[in-house]
Structure formats: C-alpha cells, structure tokens
Interface confidence: low
C-alpha cells in the first residue's frame, strides 16, 4: 500500500529519493539473450532533485530501446543514421558538442548513464533494452549483469529465463559479491528439459552491507552460466523464414598443432609486461601435449627463432624452450614485419620439409605492445606480406599488449588471416589474460570447417566457412531462407579431424519446430530473425575494415539499412530521446563508444537532463525556479 | 618523472574541516588510482581510501566513510581530501600516493600534517 | 579486511649482518603467478620508499642487498649485508583487496 511504501521509503531513501524497484530481465533463446532493465525512482522531496540512471552493459551488446516515463508523460528513444543525428545536435547547439550517454567502462563493458531532474514528489521510471548473442567458451554460456545500485532498493530482481531446444545440461548463477550463505538464500535456480530459470530478488534486509546499514552489498557481477545437451550432433533451427545453425560436435578427439609464437621483446616490454609474457609463455609451453610442435620467435631490432623450424614437444624440448624463455633479455626497436614473417616461415616449412605435420592444426600467435618501427614500418605493407606470405592456410591470432598498441591493426591483420586479435590489459592478470586466450585455441578439434545450405534457398547468409573448431566453443551459422524452402532446408557440414574426414548432414525437424513454436511462440520466430540480424550486422562491422573505400561504403550502407531495421544501436546509429534536454538545449543521445573512447569528463561537463514536460514555465518567476541539488541520488546497476 | 606535490601544514580546531591537495605531474593524471594514506605520530600506515580521476570511482576504508571526501580536478592534475568533523585522533600525516598495477604504491607526496588542537 | 602481522617489532642487526622481518597475511594473498605483497622502507619525517613488489621483485634502484620471498599467508623480507643507511622501520602491506591493509612496521636499528 501506498502509506506502507512511504514507511519503508524512510530507511531507504537518499536525500528523499528513493528506488522503488529495479528489475533485469533477460530472456534468451537459442542463444540469443534479450534484456530489459526497468528502474523506478520515487523524489519524495518537496524540492526538485537529480536522479541518475546508471548501468552497465556487455561491449558485444546492441541497445535496442530506451524510454522514459514521468507524470504519465513517455519519452522514448528515436534511432536514426548518425549523419542525420549528427546535424540535428548541430542545430541543438551551436558547440557541436553531443551529449552521449554511452561510454565504454572496463574491459568488456559499457556504462550507460543519464542524469535527470525529478520533480518534487514526482516518480520517474526507466526502461533501457539491449540484446546479444551469448558465446560459447569454455565449454559454457555466460550472462553477466552487473549489479550496483548506490541505494537500497524496495523491489530488486533479476530474471533470467533460458530456453534452449535441445534442452539444458547444466545452469549455475554466482553473485560474488554475496557471501555464500546469502548467495544460497537469495538466488533460486532451475532447469528441467529446454527450460532454465534464475532468480535473485534479495529483500531491503538482504541488500543492507550490515544489519543498521543503509548502505547495499549489491556491487559486482551476477553470472549465470549454462550449456545445452549436446546428444544429438545437429542443432538447425527454422522460423519465419531465418534459421541458426548450432555446431559444437562432442567427443572428437583433440588434433595435434603445430604453433609458432612471435614474440615482441622491443625496450617498451620492460618491467611487468616481459616478466608476464615469460610467465605466460612457461606455463603454456608446460601445457602443451607431446604430440605438438611447436618454435619461439623474437622480434626487436632483431629476428632471432629459437630453434628456426619446429621440434616435437618432448619433455627435453619443452624444458630447453622453457630455460630460452627465462633467459631471453630486451631488446631495442620493433620489427613486427620480420617477426612475423619468420614465423610463417617455421610454419609454411610443413608443406616442403615436414609432410607428415601437414595433418596437424597450425596456429601462429603474435604478440606485440607497440608500433613497428624496424624494417618494414608500412601498415599496408605489412598487411600485405602476411597475407601473401600466410596465404589462407593458418590462422594468424594477434595479441595486442596494453595501450600503445594500434589495436586496429592488429585486428585487420588477423582478420585477413583467418584469426582474430585479442587486447591484453596491461594489468596484474596479464598472464592469465594470456593463459586464457591460449586456452582457447589450446585444443583444436577439426580444421577448414565448411557448413553449406541449399543454394536456391538461401538468401542472406553469415560466415560459414572457418580455419578451425576448438574444444568448448561453438560455431553459429544464420541466414535467411527463400519462400517455400523451409521445409526442406538442410545443412551439410565437412571438416577434417584428427585422422579422419568429418562429414553430416543435418536436416529440420519440423514437427519438433512446430512443436518449439507452441511452447516458445513469437518470442522463438522474433529471436531466430534477430540473431540472424546480430550477427550479419556484427560481420558487416567488421569487414568493413579490411577492405577499400569503396567497398567499406556499400558494407556500412548494408550495416546502417539493418542497423535500422531492427533498432539497433551500432557504430552506425544513434539513438536520441525527444522531449528532454539539458541547460545548453542539448538532448541525450545514446551512440556505440569506439573500443577506445575517452572517459565520461574527457567528452565535456556532466550533463543534467530535464524533461521538457516537466520544465518550469516561462510565466514562473526565475526566484521560483527550483535548484538543483548539490548531492546527486544514484540509481545505479553499473 | 612523476611527482606529487601535497599542500603544506594545516593547524584546526576540534569540530572544523580541513582540506588538503595532491598535485600531479608528469604522467597521465586520469590513468592511474590516487591513494590516501594516514600515519599517525609514532604510529603505523593506515589506508583511507582511492579515487580513479578518469571517471572519479572512489573506495573507501569502512573507517573513515563519512570522515574523509576524495574529489579530483582533471583540469588541475589535482586530487583532495576533505577530513570534517575533525577530532584530536585525525592528527597525523597524510600522503597521497600513486597506484600502479604494476608498481604498487611506488610513488608518494611528501605528506601534510594536520594537528587539531583547540 | 585482511590483517597483516609483522614480526618483530623492532630488530638490532649488526653492520654486515642478516636482518630478516616476517609478514603474516590473515588469508592468502596469491595467486599461482603473484603474490599481492609489497614492503616498504620508511625514515623519519619522510614518506614510504617502495622497496619490493609483489613479493620478490626489486624496485628499480633499490639495492640488491633487499630481497623478499614468499606466497600465500607468509612473507619475509631479508637485508644482507646491513649497512648504516638501513636504519628505519619496514612496513609489508597487501594489494589483494580493498581495503589494502599494511602491517605494524617493524623497527630495524643498526649495531
């Protein structure tokens, strides 16, 4: 009741503003999560205050709605192509300047923050939708929600609902921030067949950091973690005429690799990093398997390999290795070309002096913190000797240590090559940053994996043709299919393991279809047609930077129309709120930061939203007008 | 070379606040945590609390919530800490000092002593 | 919060001799690759000199004379040879959580 909630209100409110509910509720299926996060905040003051709505999504997130409701009154988030957004802040404000609410945070999260005037006893609630597709790694799914309300919260909740057509083998949901016996009290999870549930909707006592405070424990990540039952090798799903192709075969054996590891030892690895690198490098050379080859490279000024081919990874080589790891000492400049043309070298000499390694999985991981500045130093140049040095038949992974290194680059060679590239924090965990990038491509299962669909029924299509498979991931294939070729839809999948020729063919089910359709409706059709657009959006993006100008402007044009048509806030959209803006008649817009964008105070002052509906009219007296508030309240998931 | 440069000797009364700043420079000021640190005379190191001024994060030791503020001004390379309601106990040196990830607290202000006296 | 014992509290060391400070962490503060432990020297009426980071490596012109070992709950710092300027009290502190707590110090006076 109303007068139980003012009660209540008492202990919980900050400055006479409190939290009446903040919900997260994630619905995923077949991969494809979708989350609404809904905040109520109550101003009981008898003066306006500033409210800010703070919280943090995954950086592989697209927001796909954002609103605003006050005194009855809804402000909704408009999405259009950034040129056009981009003069309309223009005729806003004279500055050019925008005011963002998106900003990357960490390592892989985004902070979304807006700062808004609430009337005196006046309520506001917020509403912000982002989706994703959840990746398969190590062998699981993982949800994260970062949880950090500033305040104690009446109604707090975190819903999460899975379901997965070949049903769920294991679910598991931690709140690290919770001690465990308050973690075992407050999450309640289930699964049985297709369906998961987790819940975590702690009460105000629950939330308190101790029993007088009025300060919360809810600060950290919640993870749910999942993975489907995997008995049956094919995993096609169809609806709405877009399907999602799942392939993550179980029990292949593990391929013997032959790996090359180019390692920059330039002046700037001094200190932390080179100790990292080495303690990373020894442990995983103490993981490889005796079947793998494998060779170390150097690169500074100089090129040096340890061995200049590949040796087996017997205990002796492993331990030499080990000891040319400890000993090597820096060295000056950065001949990144020389490096990792050496490399390719060790590993392109399988097809002339080592026939029997050509059935192994080759892999080169380069390692670098900086710009090449020794021998060739042309980006373009470079990108072009390792491709035509590479020539398709290993991917090349690229790992780009700290800040000073041209990430984009890195990610442009890999991509050309096969690979992908990975940024290594420069952080206390480097090592196991780099023990974990490697433990992912430490167990390939099958190499040059083709999945094919009937040519005549497939209209749009997302990459279905990859280097290699590795143990714990997953590989996801979407399109679009044509009219009246549902039905007989089928996908051929031919790969090469270890010792044999991997072949299947998958075909759909469509009584088992129609069957998922009951029991999930629309939410199954609109996910399997979203993950489709994700995905192709995600591979336009990225292709985008490997190619000439004229390709890259029909690639973006493709990315911007999709973008579009399902909402999506990507590099290419922006997303502005009508009817609120700030003191400079700015409105807040919501735009996808660049992986390295500058904090919050680097893009211009905070800025204060107030809702035009809620503005003092210009008959009132200027001594009328109410002040902010010097404290800010936070409603803060970030 | 990195430095940092705290203001100088503070006298207050019992009841008063005080506060003191720790000014940066030669490295990036929003780039690395600023700590706080307080020693008391004859005594041991007793840590207050960090601000992050890229985004102005604050932690804070459970002790000295509601006893010490940290703020920073990015433009002025420059972090402070507002001790109030000040008791004869808040009499001490304070540091501030650099954090690193890699380098743990290796940097230091020479401190600023603040004695409360009536 | 972690508590960081330090023993002993204060140390007579003859010139050219050993001194060994032993730090205990109420929970361990390493990881199978580092350990969150620093030490730091301080002399009086000056701020802390950081001496070893996370655990056994060397700030960069501190002499070699200064080592430090250990992981998980136990850590020792050793100065050999002890010389004149040694004279100060050593502090071990934990990086491993907020908040970072440091031990007691111990107090080292030369012979």
């Known amino acids: 009741s109303k007068s139980s909630e003012k009660r209540q209100a008492v202990d919980t409110a900050v400055d006479g503003v409190f939290i009446r509910s903040l919900k997260v509720n994630c619905k995923v299926t077949s991969r494809f999560a979708h989350y609404v996060v809904t905040s109520q905040v109550v101003n009981t003051a008898n003066e306006a205050r500033e409210v800010a709505f703070d919280l943090e999504i995954p950086k592989t997130a697209f927001i796909s709605d954002f609103a605003v409701t006050a005194d009855g009154n809804a402000f909704i988030g408009d999405i259009k192509d950034k040129v056009t957004a981009w003069k309309q802040y223009r005729k806003a404000a004279i500055s050019g300047e925008n005011a963002g609410l998106v900003r990357a945070s960490g390592r892989t999260m985004e902070q979304f923050t807006i700062h808004l005037t609430v009337n005196p006893q006046s309520k506001v609630t917020f509403q912000l939708t982002y989706e994703e597709v959840l990746k398969r790694n190590h062998m699981q799914y993982e949800i994260v929600i970062k949880v950090k309300p500033k305040q104690l919260v009446h109604h707090f909740e975190i819903d999460v609902d899975i379901f997965e057509p070949q049903g769920i083998s294991k679910l598991d949901a931690q709140a690290s921030f919770l001690p465990k016996e308050l973690a075992a009290q407050t999450i309640k999870k289930s699964f049985s067949g297709k369906k998961g549930h987790v819940l975590f909707r702690p009460t105000v006592s629950q939330q308190q950091s101790c029993p007088t405070c009025s300060t919360s424990l809810l600060n950290g990540h919640f993870k749910v973690t999942y993975d489907v039952s995997r008995d049956k090798i094919c995993d096609l799903l169809v609806a709405n005429n877009h399907f999602a192709h799942f392939f993550a075969p179980q029990n292949l054996t593990n391929m013997n690799k032959n790996v090359v590891f180019v390692i920059d030892i330039s002046g700037s690895m001094r200190g932390q990093k080179v100790k990292q690198t080495k303690e990373a490098l020894l442990k995983i050379l103490g993981d490889m398997q005796p079947g793998d080859y494998f060779d170390l490279v150097l690169f500074g000024t100089r090129v040096q390999s340890w061995k200049g081919s590949l040796v087996q990874a017997s205990e002796a080589n492993l331990q030499a290795a080990q000891d040319f790891v400890r000993g090597f000492s820096l060295d000056e400049a950065t001949n990144l070309n020389g490096g990792l043309l050496r490399g390719i070298e060790i590993l392109n000499q399988v097809q002339e002096s080592l026939p029997e390694l050509s059935n192994h999985a080759s892999i080169l991981i380069m390692l670098t913190d900086g710009d090449p500045t020794e021998g060739v130093t042309d980006r373009s140049q470079i990108l072009k000797n390792v491709r035509n040095a590479i020539r398709g038949r290993f991917p090349l992974y690229n790992l780009g240590f700290g800040h000073n290194v041209d990430f984009n680059f890195l990610e442009v060679m890999s991509m050309e090559n096969n690979g992908r590239a990975q940024r290594i924090y420069e952080d206390h965990d480097a090592t196991q940053q780099l023990q974990g990038f490697y433990s992912q491509v430490a167990k390939p299962l099958l190499v040059d994996v083709d999945l094919q669909y009937p040519q005549d029924a497939v209209l749009a299509l997302t990459q279905n043709h990859h280097k290699q498979y590795y143990e714990g991931s997953e590989i996801v294939v979407a399109g679009r299919i044509a009219d009246n070729k549902q039905s007989s839809f089928k996908a051929d999948v031919q790969a090469h393991g270890e010792g044999q020729e991997f072949s299947i063919t998958c075909l759909v089910d469509e009584e088992e279809m129609k069957k998922l359709l009951r029991e999930r409706g629309h939410m199954l059709e609109n996910h399997v047609e979203r993950l489709w657009a994700y995905l192709t959006i995600q591979e336009l993006l990225a292709k985008r930077m490997k190619v000439d100008r004229e390709e890259r402007a029909n690639l973006s044009s493709q990315a911007l129309q999709m973008s579009l048509d399902y909402g999506f806030v990507t590099p290419l959209t922006s997303m502005s709120i009508r009817g609120m803006a700030d003191q400079d008649g700015l409105k807040p817009t919501i735009d996808k930061p660049s992986e390295d964008s500058p904090p919050l105070e680097m893009l211009g002052p905070r800025r204060t939203f107030v809702l035009s509906a809620l503005q003092p009219s210009p008959t009132h007296s200027s001594s009328n007008t109410q002040r902010l508030p010097d404290r800010v309240t936070g409603v803060d998931t970030d | 070379e990195v430095q940092l440069q705290q203001s100088g000797t503070v006298l207050a009364r019992p009841g008063a606040s005080v506060k003191m700043s720790c000014r940066a420079s030669?490295?990036?000021?929003?780039?690395?945590?600023m700590h706080w640190v307080k020693q008391r005379p004859g005594q041991g190191l007793e840590w207050i609390g960090s601000?992050?001024?890229?985004?102005?994060?604050?932690n804070y030791n459970q002790k000295f919530k509601g006893k010490a503020k940290l703020t920073a001004v990015t433009s002025a390379s420059t972090a402070y800490m507002e001790l109030s309601s000040l008791t004869n106990e808040d009499s001490a040196v304070y540091y501030c000092?650099?954090?690193?990830?890699?380098?743990?607290?290796?940097?230091w202000g020479q401190g600023t002593l603040v004695t409360v006296s009536a | 919060d972690i508590v960081m014992t330090q023993s002993p509290a204060s140390l007579a060391v003859s010139l050219g001799q050993r001194a060994t400070i032993s730090c205990r962490a109420s929970?361990?503060?390493?990881?199978?690759?580092?350990?969150?432990m620093h030490w730091y020297q301080q002399k009086p009426g000056q701020p802390p000199k950081l001496l070893i980071k996370?655990?056994?490596n060397l700030e960069s012109g501190v002499p070699a004379r200064f080592s430090g070992s250990g992981s998980g709950t136990d850590f020792t710092l050793n100065i050999h040879p002890v010389e004149e300027e040694d004279s100060a009290t050593y502090y071990c502190?934990?990086?491993?959580?907020?908040?970072?707590?440091f031990g007691g110090g111990t107090k080292l006076e030369i012979k």
């Open positions: 000092t650099r954090y690193g990830t890699s380098e743990g607290f290796a940097y």
């Open positions: 030669g490295y990036s000021f929003t780039s690395y945590w």
């Open positions: 601000i992050y001024p890229g985004n102005t994060d604050t």
């Open positions: 929970q361990s503060v390493s990881t199978s690759s580092y350990s969150y």
């Open positions: 996370y655990a056994s």
């Open positions: 502190q934990h990086s491993w959580e907020i908040p970072p707590t």
